[in-house]
Protein backbone atom coordinates (compact mmCIF):
# COMPACT_ATOMS: atom_id res chain seq x y z
CA UNK A 1 0.00 0.00 0.00
CA UNK A 2 1.28 3.50 -0.77
CA UNK A 3 2.54 5.43 2.23
CA UNK A 4 1.74 9.09 2.85
CA UNK A 5 5.35 10.00 2.02
CA UNK A 6 5.26 8.14 -1.31
CA UNK A 7 1.91 9.76 -2.13
CA UNK A 8 3.39 13.18 -1.32
CA UNK A 9 6.39 12.48 -3.56
CA UNK A 10 4.10 11.37 -6.41
CA UNK A 11 2.00 14.50 -5.97
CA UNK A 12 5.08 16.75 -6.08
CA UNK A 13 6.40 15.00 -9.20
CA UNK A 14 3.01 15.40 -10.89
CA UNK A 15 2.93 19.07 -9.93
CA UNK A 16 6.38 19.59 -11.47
CA UNK A 17 5.34 17.72 -14.62
CA UNK A 18 2.20 19.85 -14.80
CA UNK A 19 4.17 23.09 -14.41
CA UNK A 20 6.60 22.26 -17.21
CA UNK A 21 3.83 21.12 -19.57
CA UNK A 22 2.00 24.36 -18.83
CA UNK A 23 5.20 26.32 -19.43
CA UNK A 24 5.66 24.73 -22.84
CA UNK A 25 2.02 25.42 -23.72
CA UNK A 26 2.26 29.05 -22.61
CA UNK A 27 5.33 29.56 -24.77
CA UNK A 28 3.60 28.05 -27.78
CA UNK A 29 0.41 30.05 -27.23
CA UNK A 30 2.36 33.29 -26.92
CA UNK A 31 0.85 35.47 -29.64
CA UNK A 32 4.34 36.72 -30.54
CA UNK A 33 5.48 33.17 -31.38
CA UNK A 34 6.01 33.42 -35.16
CA UNK A 35 6.40 29.67 -35.56
CA UNK A 36 3.00 28.79 -34.05
CA UNK A 37 1.29 28.22 -37.41
CA UNK A 38 4.01 25.79 -38.48
CA UNK A 39 3.98 24.05 -35.08
CA UNK A 40 0.25 23.43 -35.41
CA UNK A 41 0.76 21.44 -38.61
CA UNK A 42 2.54 18.65 -36.70
CA UNK A 43 0.38 15.83 -35.42
CA UNK A 44 0.72 13.99 -32.13
CA UNK A 45 -0.64 10.65 -31.01
CA UNK A 46 -3.16 10.82 -28.19
CA UNK A 47 -3.72 8.06 -25.64
CA UNK A 48 -6.90 6.04 -26.02
CA UNK A 49 -7.08 6.00 -22.24
CA UNK A 50 -5.16 8.07 -19.69
CA UNK A 51 -6.36 7.54 -16.15
CA UNK A 52 -3.42 5.88 -14.39
CA UNK A 53 0.28 6.60 -13.97
CA UNK A 54 1.18 3.65 -16.22
CA UNK A 55 -0.50 5.51 -19.09
CA UNK A 56 2.38 8.03 -18.98
CA UNK A 57 4.06 5.54 -21.31
CA UNK A 58 2.02 7.23 -24.06
CA UNK A 59 3.50 10.62 -23.14
CA UNK A 60 7.02 9.22 -22.97
CA UNK A 61 6.75 7.86 -26.50
CA UNK A 62 5.83 11.30 -27.85
CA UNK A 63 8.56 13.30 -26.08
CA UNK A 64 11.06 13.07 -28.94
CA UNK A 65 8.56 14.41 -31.52
CA UNK A 66 7.58 17.11 -29.01
CA UNK A 67 11.20 18.23 -28.66
CA UNK A 68 11.60 18.35 -32.44
CA UNK A 69 8.57 20.61 -32.81
CA UNK A 70 9.71 22.87 -29.95
CA UNK A 71 13.07 23.27 -31.68
CA UNK A 72 11.21 25.22 -34.37
CA UNK A 73 10.96 28.10 -31.88
CA UNK A 74 14.60 29.00 -32.67
CA UNK A 75 14.63 31.86 -30.22
CA UNK A 76 17.65 34.11 -30.24
CA UNK A 77 18.08 33.40 -26.55
CA UNK A 78 16.68 30.45 -24.62
CA UNK A 79 16.57 30.61 -20.84
CA UNK A 80 15.73 26.92 -21.12
CA UNK A 81 16.25 24.98 -24.32
CA UNK A 82 13.58 22.53 -25.50
CA UNK A 83 15.92 19.68 -24.62
CA UNK A 84 16.18 20.94 -21.01
CA UNK A 85 12.41 20.86 -20.62
CA UNK A 86 12.00 17.49 -22.34
CA UNK A 87 14.86 15.95 -20.35
CA UNK A 88 13.24 16.97 -17.06
CA UNK A 89 9.82 15.76 -18.19
CA UNK A 90 11.34 12.44 -19.25
CA UNK A 91 12.98 11.93 -15.84
CA UNK A 92 9.71 12.69 -14.03
CA UNK A 93 7.68 10.43 -16.34
CA UNK A 94 10.09 7.52 -15.86
CA UNK A 95 9.89 7.88 -12.08
CA UNK A 96 6.11 8.17 -12.06
CA UNK A 97 5.25 5.30 -14.36
CA UNK A 98 7.89 3.00 -12.93
CA UNK A 99 9.84 0.41 -14.87
CA UNK A 100 8.65 -2.78 -13.17
CA UNK A 101 5.73 -3.39 -15.53
CA UNK A 102 5.86 -2.95 -19.28
CA UNK A 103 2.74 -1.22 -20.55
CA UNK A 104 1.90 -1.19 -24.23
CA UNK A 105 0.39 2.18 -25.04
CA UNK A 106 -2.82 2.26 -27.03
CA UNK A 107 -3.42 5.36 -29.13
CA UNK A 108 -6.64 6.94 -30.27
CA UNK A 109 -7.42 6.89 -34.00
CA UNK A 110 -7.43 10.68 -34.25
CA UNK A 111 -4.17 12.60 -34.02
CA UNK A 112 -3.94 16.01 -32.35
CA UNK A 113 -2.14 19.33 -32.62
CA UNK A 114 0.63 20.17 -30.16
CA UNK A 115 -1.81 22.39 -28.23
CA UNK A 116 -4.42 19.63 -27.94
CA UNK A 117 -1.70 17.14 -26.99
CA UNK A 118 -0.31 19.32 -24.21
CA UNK A 119 -3.79 20.16 -22.92
CA UNK A 120 -4.62 16.44 -22.75
CA UNK A 121 -1.59 15.69 -20.58
CA UNK A 122 -2.12 18.80 -18.46
CA UNK A 123 -5.66 17.57 -17.76
CA UNK A 124 -4.26 14.12 -16.94
CA UNK A 125 -1.87 15.58 -14.35
CA UNK A 126 -4.59 17.72 -12.80
CA UNK A 127 -6.91 14.73 -12.62
CA UNK A 128 -4.40 12.45 -10.90
CA UNK A 129 -3.33 15.23 -8.50
CA UNK A 130 -6.96 15.75 -7.51
CA UNK A 131 -7.25 12.08 -6.53
CA UNK A 132 -4.16 12.36 -4.32
CA UNK A 133 -5.23 15.46 -2.39
Amino acid sequence: APTSSSTKKTQLQLEHLLLDLQMILNGINNYKNPKLTRMLTFKFYMPKKATELKHLQCLEEELKPLEEVLNLAQSKNFHLRPRDLISNINVIVLELKGSETTFMCEYADETATIVEFLNRWITFCQSIISTLT
Epitope: N30, F78, L80
Partner: nanobody, 119 residues
Framework: EVQLVESGGGLVQPGGSLRLSCAAS????????MGWYRQAPGKGLELVAA???????NYADSVKGRFTISRDNAKNTVYLQMNSLKPEDTAVYYC?????????????WGQGTQVTVSS
Protein backbone atom coordinates in the same frame (compact mmCIF):
# COMPACT_ATOMS: atom_id res chain seq x y z
CA GLU B 1 5.48 44.20 -11.97
CA VAL B 2 8.00 41.78 -10.50
CA GLN B 3 10.69 42.86 -8.02
CA LEU B 4 13.88 40.84 -7.64
CA VAL B 5 16.19 41.17 -4.63
CA GLU B 6 19.62 39.54 -4.88
CA SER B 7 22.09 38.73 -2.13
CA GLY B 8 25.22 36.68 -1.48
CA GLY B 9 27.84 38.29 -3.69
CA GLY B 10 31.29 39.25 -2.49
CA LEU B 11 35.02 38.64 -2.68
CA VAL B 12 36.28 35.06 -2.58
CA GLN B 13 39.58 33.32 -3.23
CA PRO B 14 40.03 30.98 -6.22
CA GLY B 15 38.68 27.53 -5.33
CA GLY B 16 36.25 29.03 -2.84
CA SER B 17 32.45 28.98 -2.73
CA LEU B 18 29.59 31.46 -2.67
CA ARG B 19 25.82 31.10 -2.60
CA LEU B 20 23.67 33.67 -4.34
CA SER B 21 19.98 34.10 -3.53
CA CYS B 22 17.25 35.96 -5.35
CA ALA B 23 13.75 36.53 -4.00
CA ALA B 24 10.95 37.51 -6.36
CA SER B 25 7.87 39.42 -5.27
CA UNK B 26 4.97 41.21 -6.91
CA UNK B 27 2.96 39.77 -9.80
CA UNK B 28 4.37 36.26 -9.63
CA UNK B 29 2.85 33.45 -11.67
CA UNK B 30 3.31 29.82 -10.64
CA UNK B 31 4.65 28.97 -14.12
CA UNK B 32 7.96 30.74 -14.59
CA UNK B 33 11.69 30.52 -15.16
CA MET B 34 14.17 32.06 -12.77
CA GLY B 35 17.90 32.14 -13.22
CA TRP B 36 21.21 33.91 -13.25
CA TYR B 37 23.05 35.77 -15.97
CA ARG B 38 26.40 37.49 -15.59
CA GLN B 39 28.38 40.27 -17.16
CA ALA B 40 32.16 40.38 -16.83
CA PRO B 41 34.02 43.67 -17.35
CA GLY B 42 34.02 44.54 -21.04
CA LYS B 43 31.92 41.49 -21.95
CA GLY B 44 28.30 40.88 -22.89
CA LEU B 45 25.56 39.38 -20.75
CA GLU B 46 25.73 35.57 -20.63
CA LEU B 47 23.53 32.87 -19.18
CA VAL B 48 24.92 31.15 -16.10
CA ALA B 49 22.00 28.90 -15.15
CA ALA B 50 18.21 28.85 -15.25
CA UNK B 51 15.50 26.71 -13.69
CA UNK B 52 11.78 26.35 -14.34
CA UNK B 53 9.12 26.06 -11.66
CA UNK B 54 8.88 22.41 -12.73
CA UNK B 55 12.59 21.82 -12.16
CA UNK B 56 14.03 21.93 -15.69
CA UNK B 57 17.56 23.35 -15.67
CA ASN B 58 20.02 24.84 -18.13
CA TYR B 59 23.69 25.55 -17.37
CA ALA B 60 26.40 27.36 -19.29
CA ASP B 61 29.11 24.87 -20.30
CA SER B 62 31.67 26.91 -18.37
CA VAL B 63 29.94 26.32 -15.01
CA LYS B 64 28.66 22.74 -15.38
CA GLY B 65 29.80 20.56 -12.50
CA ARG B 66 30.79 23.60 -10.40
CA PHE B 67 27.55 25.59 -10.05
CA THR B 68 24.16 24.28 -8.94
CA ILE B 69 20.90 26.15 -9.39
CA SER B 70 17.90 25.36 -7.20
CA ARG B 71 14.69 27.03 -6.19
CA ASP B 72 12.00 27.15 -3.55
CA ASN B 73 8.68 27.64 -5.35
CA ALA B 74 6.83 28.40 -2.12
CA LYS B 75 9.21 31.29 -1.40
CA ASN B 76 9.64 32.38 -5.06
CA THR B 77 13.36 32.22 -4.46
CA VAL B 78 16.18 30.93 -6.64
CA TYR B 79 19.65 29.97 -5.41
CA LEU B 80 22.99 29.58 -7.14
CA GLN B 81 25.58 27.51 -5.28
CA MET B 82 28.96 28.35 -6.79
CA ASN B 83 31.86 26.03 -5.96
CA SER B 84 35.45 25.81 -7.24
CA LEU B 85 35.31 29.45 -8.24
CA LYS B 86 37.81 30.74 -10.80
CA PRO B 87 39.04 34.28 -11.53
CA GLU B 88 37.10 34.13 -14.83
CA ASP B 89 33.87 33.85 -12.82
CA THR B 90 34.37 37.45 -11.72
CA ALA B 91 31.34 39.41 -12.91
CA VAL B 92 28.15 41.15 -11.91
CA TYR B 93 25.51 38.43 -11.50
CA TYR B 94 21.95 39.35 -12.41
CA CYS B 95 18.85 37.48 -11.30
CA UNK B 96 16.21 36.96 -13.99
CA UNK B 97 12.50 36.15 -13.88
CA UNK B 98 10.64 35.13 -17.03
CA UNK B 99 7.19 33.79 -17.84
CA UNK B 100 8.45 31.77 -20.80
CA UNK B 101 11.35 29.46 -21.56
CA UNK B 102 12.59 31.83 -24.25
CA UNK B 103 13.62 35.45 -23.87
CA UNK B 104 11.10 38.18 -24.52
CA UNK B 105 10.35 41.73 -23.44
CA UNK B 106 8.36 40.63 -20.38
CA UNK B 107 11.49 39.35 -18.61
CA UNK B 108 12.48 41.03 -15.35
CA TRP B 109 16.00 41.64 -14.05
CA GLY B 110 17.54 42.33 -10.68
CA GLN B 111 20.01 45.13 -9.91
CA GLY B 112 22.95 42.73 -9.89
CA THR B 113 25.38 41.51 -7.26
CA GLN B 114 29.16 41.67 -7.67
CA VAL B 115 31.18 38.45 -7.46
CA THR B 116 34.95 38.86 -7.40
CA VAL B 117 37.28 35.86 -7.44
CA SER B 118 40.79 36.95 -6.56
CA SER B 119 43.68 35.99 -4.30
Amino acid sequence: EVQLVESGGGLVQPGGSLRLSCAASGSIFSINVMGWYRQAPGKGLELVAAISSGGSTNYADSVKGRFTISRDNAKNTVYLQMNSLKPEDTAVYYCMYASSWYEDETDYWGQGTQVTVSS
